[in-house]
Each structure stands twice: as C-alpha cells, then as structure tokens.
Interface confidence: medium
C-alpha cells in the first residue's frame, strides 16, 4: 500500500522534523527516581525542535515513529562502586498519559559506570517520556556523559 | 538524480542527506591520542557522502543537526585487562576550528572491552570531529568492532 | 519558516521510509546461534514498515544505507554469571544471500549483562540480517531489554 497517491505530496516541512537533545538538570527528591532534563541553545548544545519539556520531562508533539536514545554515566563511580551499589537501573518509558504507560528501554549498570542505548518506538502527541534511575548512585551532569534525545523518523 | 520527475519536488541533494561511516585506519603516534579513520567502498562497507576526511579526521560539509555514533572495541582485551589498564576513555569532540572545540561524547571502558554510544548534536560546515582514545590499550581494527559515523538529521 | 516553498514537494512514499523494530520471539535449537525475531502491532510496540520477516530473520526490501541498532540483555544474569560464561558474543550480519555474507556489528558481554550498539551500513533488497548469540546464556525476552531494528536513511 502506498503512503500517498503520487499527486498527493507533502511539503518538506510537514514531514515532521521533530527532534530534541537534552542535558541533565537535576535528580528528583529522594522518593522520585526520575531524572529532570533541560534543553535550549543558551545551555550549550541541547535543543528542542517540536517536543517540549514539562517539569523536566519530555513531551511529544507529533505522532510518529521516533528514535529514542540515551546515555547516562554514573558520577563518583568505578566498576567496584557500580557492583557494590547494584542494582542500579535506568528505564525510559511513557509515564503519561497513564493509559499509555509502558517501559520502552531498560538497562542495568552491573560493573559499568555508563549505559547507552537507542530504539525505535511509536509515540503519540501528548506522550510524556520519563527516565527513571533507580539505586543510590548519582548521574554525572557533564553534558558529554549524560544526555537524552528523540528524533522523529516517520509517520 | 531526483527521487521523482515532477517539477513540484525537491532534489535529493537539497535534503542534505550527508552521511558517513568510517573504519579505523590507525592510531596516532605516542603523544597523539586521536584515532585515524578511513572510508570508501573500496575498503568494504565504509563510505562518505558529503563529509570528508582530513588527515584521518572527519570534516563536516553541511550545517545541521547530526546523529553521531561510535563503537570502539579494545584489542587483546578481557575484563581483567580493561580494569587493570583503567582509565581507558574514548571522547568524541569538535577539535577544529579551535573556537568551537568541545567534547561531545565521552565514555570509559571500566571492566568492559567495548563502548558504543550515539547522540544528536548541531554541527557546522568546517567542523572537524576527533576521537581521542586515552590509555595504553589499543583498539581493534576489525570493521564490525570499531566504527564511527555521522548522519545529517535536519537543518 | 518552511524548509521549502509549498510547491516543492516529495511524495512521501518516494522517501523510502522503510523501518522495522522487532522483539525477541525465541532462540534457535542447540546448534543454531541465531535469535528469532517477531514484530507487529498485535505484539506491542514492534512493527515492520517495508522490511519483512523470513523465518524470524529480517529481510530488506529497499536498497539504501540503513541505521541498524540492537540491544540484547541476558536473562538471569549478574556480572559474575557473565564473566563465568565468557565469551558470550552477539554478532549482527548479512547471512543471505551467501555471496553477501558479512559480519556488520559484533560485541562481547564480558562482565556486563547488556550490549547495545548501532551502525550505518549499506543494505540491498533481499539481504537477510541474522543476529547470532554465541555462548550458553539465554537472552531476556522482555521487550524493553531486547530489541533489534533498522531504519532506512538514504539511497
């Protein structure tokens, strides 16, 4: 099945170049495992073109399939620390609306101090993505060590 | 060549499909932590469509937001080797022009022998990306274990 | 500001939006190191738009450069398990047609329980990608821990 009849064409703009790359702002209070993100040219190399931040969490503005990627590096960490504080786990998921809540991507640190991964997933307008870091170790806020982003790929 | 004949269409070139995937050529002399890359169909599955190599470093030809990705595997490595030679760190950054010098992505090997990550970042025409491997261990030159690439994502 | 004037338009289909994200179905019989994948909205968040599954392996339908990504998490795994069962290795490659057989991406688990990576590679219509997990440990079937996907990037 064709996406569209040949004569039905899309302006390039409407292709939905939604994209965001965020840097860590801070961790949550003690009982809140979420990481809080920030983005914008004034902050350096982070940006939001389409998606928005809602209290430090990323909200999607356009339906489609997205490439979601993340890297989190633990601060004050060695392989010994990481294994001693195991399990330290990072999960990226849709946290609202509640009806669509699901874990999209999950990694444990084991004896490492950095996790990095990416995946394709369908997201809908209004989906809010949360990144939960469980465990007692803190993430590094260096912008080249901890970052989170999404890229719209197709309708 | 255009995707389609009609006059109401964008030439492929104007979409900015700049993309490159490189394989390791060699490491630098003793005081130079940079990895030197190579690419081109004659070498296998590496290629450069837009970006260019300048003395083994990747130079960007089109402004935009890029997905930068890398995987580096250490040669003759076990988790014991990796931890004994710690810290071994890989950093990808803009190394020239000097006014734009910045680290974009950084990972340590800890007890692992491979790092892999990716991130979105704005790059400008003329930016040269360097990949610095610090430590005493050498990278594998196997093309399925060590590679570095960029993909233009949007203006 | 629009990326292009309204009259300069591309048929969506001609952009080659081939994309797939798969979840693990099962492992092969004892002498078969391949992972067998499944995808489709009925299964959750996995999908195939363009590529197809052929006996659990991913077959490409459109020539081009693709971003290939994978994450595999070992089940019932700790860093001790992972190192005791070393080497456990994951390789993604073209397994058919035989004339194009090649390893595209390879990672070992060492003391970790998850590997994740991605790379750009040219693929041709009819290429079948296989993911080989060698070693005695089993992969997790959780859809947020083990997944495999491709995204068409350019011709």
């Amino acid at each position: 099945q064709r996406f569209a009849q040949a004569q039905q064409q899309l302006p390039l703009e409407s292709l939905g170049w939604d994209v965001a790359e965020l840097q860590l702002n801070h961790t949550g209070p003690q009982q809140d495992p979420r990481l809080y993100w920030q983005g914008g040219p004034a902050l350096g190399r982070s940006f939001l073109h389409g998606p928005e931040l809602d209290k430090g969490q990323l909200r999607i503005h356009r339906d489609g399939i997205y490439m979601v990627h993340i890297q989190v590096t633990l601060a004050i960490c060695s392989s010994t620390t990481a294994s001693r504080h195991h399990p330290t786990t990072l999960a990226v998921g849709i946290c609202s609306p509640a009806s669509r809540s699901i874990s999209l991507l999950r990694l444990s640190f084991h004896q490492g101090c950095t996790i990095a991964s990416q995946r394709l997933t369908p997201l809908a307008r209004g989906d809010t993505l949360c990144t939960n870091l469980t465990g007692t170790l803190l993430p590094s806020r260096n912008t080249d060590e901890t970052f989170f982003g999404v890229q719209w790929v197709r309708p | 060549q255009r995707f389609a004949q009609a006059q109401q269409q964008l030439p492929l070139e104007s979409l900015g499909w700049d993309v490159a995937e490189l394989q390791l050529n060699h490491t630098g002399p003793q005081q130079d932590p940079r990895l030197y890359w190579q690419g081109g169909p004659a070498l296998g599955r590496s290629f450069l469509h837009g970006p260019e190599l300048d003395k083994g470093q990747l130079r960007i030809h089109r402004d935009g937001i890029y997905m930068v990705h890398i995987q580096v595997t250490l040669a003759i490595c076990s988790s014991t080797t990796a931890s004994r030679h710690h810290p071994t760190t890989l950093a990808v950054g803009i190394c020239s022009p000097a006014s734009r010098s910045i680290s974009l992505l950084r990972l340590s090997f800890h007890q692992g022998c491979t790092i892999a990550s990716q991130r979105l970042t704005p790059l400008a025409r003329g930016d040269t990306l360097c990949t610095n491997l610090t430590g005493t261990l050498l990278p594998s030159r196997n093309t399925d274990e060590t590679f570095f690439g960029v993909q233009w994502v949007r203006p | 500001q629009r990326f292009a004037q309204a009259q300069q338009q591309l048929p969506l289909e001609s952009l080659g939006w081939d994309v797939a994200e798969l979840q693990l179905n099962h492992t092969g019989p004892q002498q078969d190191p391949r992972l067998y994948w499944q995808g489709g909205p009925a299964l959750g968040r996995s999908f195939l738009h363009g590529p197809e599954l052929d006996k659990g392996q991913l077959r490409i339908h459109r020539d081009g450069i693709y971003m290939v990504h994978i994450q595999v998490t070992l089940a019932i795994c700790s860093s001790t398990t992972a190192s005791r069962h070393h080497p456990t290795t994951l390789a993604v490659g073209i397994c058919s047609p035989a004339s194009r057989s090649i390893s595209l991406l390879r990672l070992s688990f060492h003391q970790g329980c998850t590997i994740a990576s991605q790379r750009l590679t040219p693929l041709a219509r009819g290429d079948t990608l296989c993911t080989n997990l060698t070693g005695t440990l089993l992969p997790s079937r959780n859809t947020d821990e083990t997944f495999f996907g491709v995204q068409w990037v350019r011709p």
Epitope: Q23, H26, G40, A75, I76, L138, R141, E145 | I102 | -
Partner: antibody, heavy 122, light 110 residues
C-alpha cells in the same frame, strides 16, 4: 599536569567592579564544570559559583547572586568572574577550581589555582 | 553561623591516629551528604583528599580514610606525619547545587 592560574585581583572600593580570570592548561578544559571558591582572611572556604562545561548553565551562592557573573571561553581555556557592586565582605582570596565531574549536583574540586586576593576597602 | 561544624583544632603525635569530624548544626550527616575532605597548608591552595564519604582521591596516601561515625562524617589519619600538619576542611552537599564548607580544623602534629 593540570594548572589553574588566577589573575585580576586587587584593591577596589565598595560598590566597584573587578573581573577575575583563570587560565587553564594541562587538561581538556571544555569537558569540565568550573567553579570559583573564596576564602576570607583567616576564615573557611565558601563556594561562590559554577558554570557547566559548555557555558550555558550557571549557579551562584545566595551571597553573590545578582552581583557576580561567571563565564568561560573554551577556545581560550579561560574562566572569568565579573564582580560588580563589591562589598567589604567580598574581601577574600578567590580560587578557580575544577569540578571533578563526579556528580550531578555535588561539586567536588579536584584541582585548584593558587588564588588571587580581592580587597574591598575605602 | 556555620551550618557545617568541625573541631577548631586537634593535636596528634607523630605516628599516632587522629579522627576529625564533620557534623550538621541540625541533623545527622549521611552518605547522601557526600562528605568531601580537603587539606590546606599555609599559603597553599586546598587539596582534595576524600570524596563520596570514603573514596580517596588519586595520589592520596592510604593513611587517610573517610567514614560515617555515628551522626558525623569522619576523616581518620593513621600514622600521622609531620607534613600532615595543615587545616582540614569538610564539605557537605546540603541543597542543590551548592556545597557548604565547615569552618576547618587546624591539625597540629606535635
């Protein structure tokens, strides 16, 4: 070897301004958060301000908020502190300090300069 | 008034052991305060010794160790040497994004 060298201190009248500089060498400056920490004569240490590695995010101690501005120029491997509306209680040795990058909100200073003395007096 | 408290001065004999403490004016110190210890000799810049309660910074001799003792952070020096004579500052994370330093402990090796 990591080196941090402060300059720009001196005697200034209350209400005046001063700009401190810190020249960094021996490490990849653009990777690290940087800080200013001060020490009044015969007293303890007080954290003043920090700036992230790209220069876009800054934080200040309440005692200097609105009066001091931290900035950096990664191309020159330099950190700055613009001090306006200076008060007698700002008299101190000002140290440039590198954040080890260990934590998302716990500055840990693994390298320090020798300091530059700022005296605010009429 | 200082939020972070330290003994103003302590004395130790060469080869002896001494423990410096770091407390909160109100409340207990835990590892969540990420206690950090710095050493400063006269006319010199401070030097990082211990971070994250008990992790020694690179190059710091193993006679320096950190811990939580009761409701305070502690820096213990075993086998004190003459060149350990210095002022020691502790720093605690109390509120994002700053740290609070203690008033310092002047250690004399006598």
């Amino acid at each position: 070897e990591v080196q941090l060298v402060e300059s720009g201190g001196g005697l200034v009248q209350p209400g005046g301004s001063l700009r401190l500089s810190c020249a960094a060498s021996g490490f990849t400056f653009s990777v690290y958060y940087m800080n200013w920490v001060r020490q009044a004569p015969g007293k303890g240490l007080e954290w003043v301000s920090d700036i992230n590695n790209e220069g876009g995010t800054t934080y200040y101690a309440d005692s200097v908020k609105g009066r001091f501005t931290i900035s950096r120029d990664n191309s020159k491997n330099s950190l700055y502190l613009q001090m306006n509306s200076l008060r007698a209680e700002d008299t101190a040795v000002y140290y440039c300090a590198r954040d080890a990058g260990y934590s998302n909100h716990v500055p840990i200073f693994d390298s320090w300069g020798q300091g530059t003395l700022v005296t605010v007096s009429s | 008034q200082a939020v972070v408290t330290q003994e103003p001065s302590l004395t130790v004999s060469p080869g002896g052991t001494v423990t410096l403490t770091c407390g909160l004016k109100s409340g207990s110190v835990t590892s969540d305060n990420f206690p950090t210890w710095y050493q400063q000799t006269p006319g010199q810049a401070p030097r990082l010794l211990i971070y994250n309660t008990n992790t020694r910074h690179s190059g710091v001799p193993d006679r320096f160790s950190g811990s939580i003792l009761g409701n305070k952070a502690a820096l213990t020096i075993t086998g004190a040497q003459a060149d350990d004579e210095a002022e020691y500052f502790c720093a605690l994370f109390i509120s994002n994004p700053s740290v609070e330093f203690g008033g310092g402990t002047q250690l004399t090796v006598l």
